[in-house]
Amino acid sequence: CKAMHVAQPAVVLASSRGIASFVCEYASPGKATEVRVTVLRQADSQVTEVCAATYMMGNELTFLDDSICTGTSSGNQVNLTIQGLRAMDTGLYICKVELMYPPPYYLGIGNGTQIYVIDPEPCPDSDF
């Protein structure tokens, strides 16, 4: 397993609809043809996989399991969008990138993006 640098923004604020987007960029040491990207949420000491996708270079991302994420890839960048976030989902979202093929296998883990989610205030009753 060889190490690889992964960059991601330090802070992102989710929209009022609970949507947060960020870019995960990796320094590919070679010409990878198959990549797996995983987003991990770290809150307190617990780490949970939020979403994961595999893709062949130039193709669309195929997300695994009951994913709340969407995304696109462009070169060594993956644009990720997480939906359905609530205030309780505020936390550190870490991007993990694996270059699966061809060998050798490379693994890179970003420092994380702190995503802040603020639940929208309910609209006050209107007399109109």
């Epitope: 797996r36 995983t38 617990q46 780490v47 949970t48 996989e49 979403c51 994961a52 595999t54 195929t62 997300f63 695994l64 399991d65 009951d66 994913s67 709340i68 939906q83 359905g84 694996e98 699966m100 093929y101 296998y105």
Partner: antibody
């Protein structure tokens, strides 16, 4: 604690449809999706697909595309799997399952629902 | 789709034996490999996830190893309650796929 309780056994005629329910409890239903697996008598496990409870997005196994529909009712915390145009090959125990902290890993399973298709 | 091949398909062993089951993926899946135990008439029970992590509540006589394409489930000292069928499953990519199963029977 997390519990998944499935509907009872069904006997169906060939060509008919079946709907299996999976009632979830012990967690916030929309925080996790539900996956469905099946197991023919004496055979191995087959992944059928999953549904994201939060937004209703679904992803089905290619061989079942067009015949299977997975839905959720967030008001009752229940997931449903409907399979149409049944044949004897669809005779199986159908399971719903939920992931834990890791994607595609299933610590939580329903008890199973036997669907028998007779011709 | 990723094919998962388990071997052997069945084995006979005695209480106290060390049992090893192997699982091979048709392509590299890193450590995204899980093991389940299933008893007749019951749902599968998760034993090992991500190749080597022991699921909470599972006895320590169960262990998993491997990465890439080749994986192993080991039962260090077989107990009467361990006679069951064991399945591997990859969680690397969709569609999720299972091995054909290994039935562990009493010798």
């Amino acid at each position: 604690q997390v519990q998944l309780v499935q509907s009872g056994a069904e006997v169906k005629m060939s060509g008919a449809s079946v709907r299996v329910s999976c009632k979830a409890s012990g967690y916030t239903f929309t925080s996790y999706g539900i996956s469905w697996m099946r197991q023919a008598p004496g055979q191995g496990l087959e992944w059928m697909g999953w549904i994201t409870a939060y937004n209703g997005n679904s992803n089905y196994a290619q061989k079942l595309q067009g015949r299977v529909t997975m839905t959720t009712d967030t008001s009752t915390g229940t997931a449903y799997m409907e399979l149409r145009s049944l044949t004897s090959d669809d005779t199986a125990v159908y399971y719903c399952a939920r992931r834990g902290d890791y994607l595609g890993v299933f610590p939580y399973w329903g008890q199973g629902t036997l669907v028998t298709v007779s011709s | 789709d990723i094919q998962m091949t388990q071997s052997p398909s069945s084995l006979s062993a005695s209480v106290g034996d060390r049992v090893t089951i192997t699982c091979r993926a048709s392509q590299s899946i890193s450590s995204y490999l899980n093991w389940y135990q299933q008893k007749p008439g019951k749902a599968p029970n998760l034993l090992i996830y991500t190749a080597s992590s022991l699921q909470s509540g599972v006895p320590s006589r169960f262990s998993g190893s491997g990465s890439g394409t080749d994986f192993t489930l080991t039962i260090s000292s077989l107990q009467p309650e361990d006679f069951a069928t064991y399945y591997c499953q990859q969680s690397y990519s969709s569609p999720l796929t299972f091995g054909g199963g290994t039935k562990v029977e009493i010798k």
